[in-house]
Structures are given as structure tokens and as C-alpha cells.
């Protein structure tokens, strides 16, 4: 048996991220003998479920089964049949379902109940579907990126796994942007916190971490846009909204009922003398930026320092990974490079937003118009949120790394969630074993 590797015992796990705008299924795998090591779990597949987020199925719950079928069947194909029964399946729903629960706990429970029944029909070890808290979403995103960057490893390497990895053990902060909420999570310099609600303590691999986290519900990119529209239509003189966040020449009719459907626009709701209004784009970054800033209340802060809306935010510390929609939007706009300064990003946004809609449609012919039309707003919103909301500066901008994947695994909360629920992150540093499964015998 000289030079013959022992057969690897591989384990799998499945996490469904039921987001506000869509659901994605992630399949992870790892060598069973190394499950307490750091950095051994990696993503083998992402399956994006066709259709909107699960909260949209509230009136058609009997279709949730067919909605999830293709991705669940894909998991059945990818994972060896012999492993099906021991493969855990978790579904975590985020801010879209938090908002539905705010409107009706009964409806949210009904959706989750049907999701659970649908997922129980598959041969996997279904572990439940639940709405995770904003704190969990922030914490698990932070765990994911630092796990994948090797920040929890006690072994110092002479090489870097990823371009922006430094060999120190300083953790990265996590910036997550979804459709309905956004999270900021990092280890501040000062261990004492003024706001216990925003404090988390972890012991991971023998080291203590005091982490700050906050999730801003209604400040994901889609809900922020609804908020902005609801705010701006209040002062419109008629059913035409001249909007600087959309390209010149862009036109779209919006139903007032759609605008006021979300709890996020309640604070701006008023009786309007029309049922519909038309957005007419004028494409002006500076004016768009000013309009977005009005969503952040910075006039009130009961702490030494706040982000916005009276929420405590300690001074920023270290490098940050910005993922999910932070990455998707900035990647589309070609602004993820480490070399692009904040000033250059602003300049590029000004240029992009001012481009006529017909020109934009021609330049990006393959992109769905609904998404294409919103990149000017989304890019402006990201800049406003990072600079005015979280107080990044032109100098600290270079500490933001826009990350899609790390080592082939998507940055996001799902991996951290699974690592936690499968007890794969030990509190203490595991003792290194003399022989690992890959040792030749």
C-alpha cells in the first residue's frame, strides 16, 4: 500500500439563504477527519432559485414546493446518494421575512411552515427553517470571511491565500448589503462597549473576540430605494417624480400601493391624489446623493459616536470585507479594484449616472432593464452608506475590500451559520493530530 492515499471521508452540508429578493442554495463539503480545523470547509455549488424571495409567496404558499424543487434536486445530484441521509439542511430567512413577520406573524409562520414541509420531503437531514436575527446575520458573515481568510488559524503561513490577506491574525470587519437590510460587524479597538445590544463575545479556536455588530432593517438597497421614492413623492407637485437617481430619459410607472406595501415606507406614508406616478430620470449623482442622505438621521446620537438613526458605532478599525450587494453592484460598475480611490469611485459614479438611458441599454444589452436601471441608485447608495452612514473616509476607503468569493466560497452569512450549527468552530484550539487522513502509509 506504499504511496496509496487512504480514501477520504467527505461530509456535506446544505444552507438555503432565503433573502428578500431571491433564495440561494449553497452546498459545502469538508474532510470528516478535519472538521475542527480552520479553513477546510469549502463551497462546491451555489444554486440560485428562480423567482423572488419566499416572502413574496405569502399568497401562493402551495407553490413554494415547486419553487424550491430545481435547486433541491440539484443538491441530490451533487451529493453522493450514500451521504444524503447524513447531510444537514438548514434554511435561514433574513430581512424580507423579518419585514413580513412585522406585518403578520401568522403569515410569516405559514410561509415557514410550508417551506419546512417542502424541505422535509427530500432525503437529507433537514434541520429546520427559521428567520435569523440581524445580529446573527452580521455575526455569521464576519465568521465566514475570517474563517475563509484563515484569520482563526494559529499557524502563521509564509504565503498568502488571497491577494488582500496579510499574514497577521487581525480579523477583517464584515460589511454585508442585502435587499432589505445591511450589516456592519468588526472588532473595535476599545473592548468596552457603550451599547450592549451591539456587543457579541466569541471564543473561537482558543481566542476571545469582542465584536461590534448592527443590522439596519430597511436599509438594504431595495428597501432604501422604496424609502427614497416614498420620501420624494411627498413633495412632488403632481404624478411625475423627476428623479436624479435614474438615467436621463428613463421612465417608469410606479403603483402607490406597491410603494406603501412595505413597512419600510410607513414613516413617509401619506394620502396622495393619484394611484400611480411616473419616475422620470434626470441622472445627477450629486442630487441623488443628497436625496439618499435624507434617509439617514444624523441629528440625534445618545452615544459618543453613531452611525445614523441614533445607533452606536465605535471608531472603525482595520480592514473590511464588503460582500453580497456591496460586491455585486461595485463589480458591475467595475469599481472593485484595490487601486480605485474613493474620489475616483465618486467621479465614475457621476459619469455613469449622467449617461442617457438609451445609451446605457445599448451598452449593457444583456442585462435585465429592471436591474440595469437601478445601478445608478445602488452605487450612489453604497457610497452614501459607507461614507456618511458608517464614516469611512477617503483615506480609510482603501481598507474596504469588495469581495465576491474567497477561495471559491461566497462571502456571506451561510457558511458561518453552518459552521456554528454543525459545531465545527471549536472554542479551544484543537490539538494537532500526528496523522491526518492524507498521510501516506
Amino acid at each position: 500500500t506504499q504511496n496509496k492515499a487512504l480514501p477520504e471521508n467527505i461530509k456535506y452540508g446544505i444552507v438555503l439563504d432565503a433573502g428578500s429578493s431571491h433564495t440561494s442554495l449553497y452546498i459545502y463539503k469538508w474532510p470528516a477527519e478535519k472538521e475542527n480545523d480552520t479553513g477546510v470547509v469549502h463551497q462546491v455549488e451555489e444554486c440560485r432559485v428562480k423567482g423572488p424571495g419566499i416572502s413574496k409567496y405569502v399568497q401562493k404558499v402551495n407553490e413554494i414546493g415547486i419553487y424550491l424543487t430545481d435547486c433541491m434536486e440539484r443538491a441530490r445530484e451533487v451529493i453522493p446518494r450514500s451521504q444524503h441521509q447524513e447531510t444537514p439542511v438548514y434554511l435561514g430567512a433574513t430581512a424580507g421575512m423579518r419585514l413580513l413577520r412585522m406585518e403578520s406573524e401568522e403569515l410569516a409562520d405559514r410561509v415557514l411552515d410550508v417551506v419546512e414541509r417542502s424541505l422535509s420531503n427530500y432525503p437529507f437531514d433537514f434541520q429546520g427553517a427559521r428567520i435569523i436575527t440581524g445580529q446573527e446575520e452580521g455575526a455569521y458573515g464576519w465568521i465566514t470571511i475570517n474563517y475563509l481568510l484563515g484569520k482563526f488559524s494559529q499557524k502563521t503561513r509564509w504565503f498568502s491565500i488571497v491577494p488582500y490577506e496579510t499574514n497577521n491574525q487581525e480579523t477583517f470587519g464584515a460589511l454585508d448589503l442585502g435587499g432589505a437590510s445591511t450589516q456592519i460587524t468588526f472588532v473595535p479597538q476599545n473592548q468596552t462597549t457603550e451599547s450592549p445590544d451591539n456587543a457579541l463575545q466569541f471564543r473561537l479556536y482558543g481566542k476571545d473576540y469582542n465584536v461590534y455588530t448592527h443590522s439596519f432593517l430597511c436599509y438594504g438597497k431595495d428597501q432604501a430605494l422604496w424609502q427614497k421614492l416614498a420620501k420624494d413623492i411627498q413633495v412632488a407637485s403632481n404624478e411625475i417624480l423627476r428623479d436624479p437617481c435614474f438615467h436621463p430619459g428613463y421612465k417608469k410607472v410606479v403603483n402607490v400601493s406597491d410603494l406603501y406595501k412595505t413597512p419600510c415606507t410607513k414613516r413617509f406614508e401619506m394620502t396622495l391624489p393619484f394611484q400611480q406616478f411616473e419616475i422620470q430620470g434626470i441622472g445627477n449623482y450629486q442630487q441623488c446623493h443628497q436625496s439618499v442622505l435624507e434617509l439617514f438621521n444624523t441629528s440625534y446620537c445618545p452615544y459618543s459616536q453613531c452611525a445614523f438613526n441614533g445607533i452606536f458605532l465605535p471608531p472603525l478599525q482595520g480592514d473590511f470585507g464588503a460582500f453580497s450587494a456591496f460586491y455585486f453592484v461595485m463589480n458591475f460598475l467595475n469599481l472593485t479594484s484595490e487601486k480605485v480611490s474613493q474620489e475616483k469611485v465618486t467621479e465614475m459614479m457621476k459619469k455613469f449616472c449622467s449617461q442617457p438611458w438609451e445609451e446605457i441599454k445599448t451598452s449593457y444589452a444583456g442585462v435585465k432593464e429592471k436591474y440595469l436601471s437601478e445601478y445608478c441608485f445602488s452605487g450612489t447608495y453604497i457610497l452614501s452608506l459607507l461614507l456618511q452612514g458608517y464614516h469611512f473616509t477617503a483615506d480609510s476607503w482603501e481598507h474596504i475590500h469588495f469581495i465576491g468569493k474567497i477561495q471559491g466560497s461566497d462571502a456571506g452569512w451561510t457558511l458561518g451559520y453552518m459552521l456554528n450549527l454543525t459545531n465545527m468552530i471549536p472554542a479551544e484550539q484543537p490539538l494537532s493530530t500526528p496523522l491526518s487522513h492524507s498521510t501516506y502509509v
Epitope: S20, S21, H22, K50, G51, P52, G53, K56, Y57, Q59, K60, I66, Y67, T69, D70, E73, G96, G179, D222, D258, K368, K370
Partner: nanobody
């Protein structure tokens, strides 16, 4: 526009079988999901079985193990094989073809087409 034409309904004894067909014509590239719904007298619409573009299926608990949905993409036709029929399966059966919208505003379905329905009666 997509047109859906159902056939294969009729009168059958309990324990018997029927095969319903639904032929789609027109602008069918936009269709991903096809399904059979039914409406019993005095009741609401009930989703019986559905099939995705990839051929994956889903069934109502009441018909699992008795009914089979299948799809022949070359003929643009979806079938519902109904075995071990019971009196409670009596209904008008409708073929439905649709695709979901990816957007969080407006309707859930981007396209939504329905057939005229075919009557299935299970009686001795």
C-alpha cells in the same frame, strides 16, 4: 401569447385511470413551469402537480403516489397520468403554464397562461 389545450378528461370508475394532456402553442419559450390545477364543485382551485423546465416534479399530498406529471418538450405537451382514481378526484382540471418574476414588486408571475379545463368525473 400562449394557448393551452387540455384533453383526456371523462367519466371513469373508482380505481380506474385517465391520462390528461395539455398541448401548448404560441410563444412558449417564456414558459418554465407547467402544472395541473383542479376545481371541485363548490371548492377553490387546488394545485395538483407541477413540473419545472428541468423536469423536476412536485405533488399535492392528496395525489402523491397515484398521479404522475410528465413533460415532452419536443411536443410542447404536459401530461397527467391519474391512477387509482377516487370520487374526491372529481373536478375540472386546468392546465397552467407560467414563469416567476425575479422582482419584488408587481405580480409574482411574469407570465401566466391557463387552459379552458377538462372535466374528470369519478363515479360508479
Amino acid at each position: 401569447e400562449v394557448q393551452l389545450l387540455e384533453s383526456g378528461g371523462g367519466l371513469v370508475q373508482p380505481g380506474g385511470s385517465l391520462r390528461l394532456s395539455c398541448a401548448a402553442s404560441g410563444d412558449i419559450f417564456s414558459i418554465n413551469y407547467m402544472s395541473w390545477y383542479r376545481q371541485a364543485p363548490g371548492k377553490g382551485l387546488e394545485l395538483v402537480a407541477a413540473i419545472t423546465g428541468r423536469g423536476n416534479t412536485n405533488y399535492a399530498d392528496s395525489v402523491k403516489g397515484r398521479f404522475t406529471i410528465s413533460r415532452d418538450n419536443s411536443k410542447n405537451t404536459v401530461y397527467l397520468q391519474m391512477n387509482s382514481l377516487r370520487a374526491e378526484d372529481t373536478a375540472v382540471y386546468y392546465c397552467n403554464a407560467w414563469d416567476y418574476s425575479d422582482y419584488d414588486e408587481g405580480p409574482l408571475r411574469e407570465y401566466d397562461y391557463w387552459g379552458q379545463g377538462t372535466q374528470v368525473t369519478v363515479s360508479s
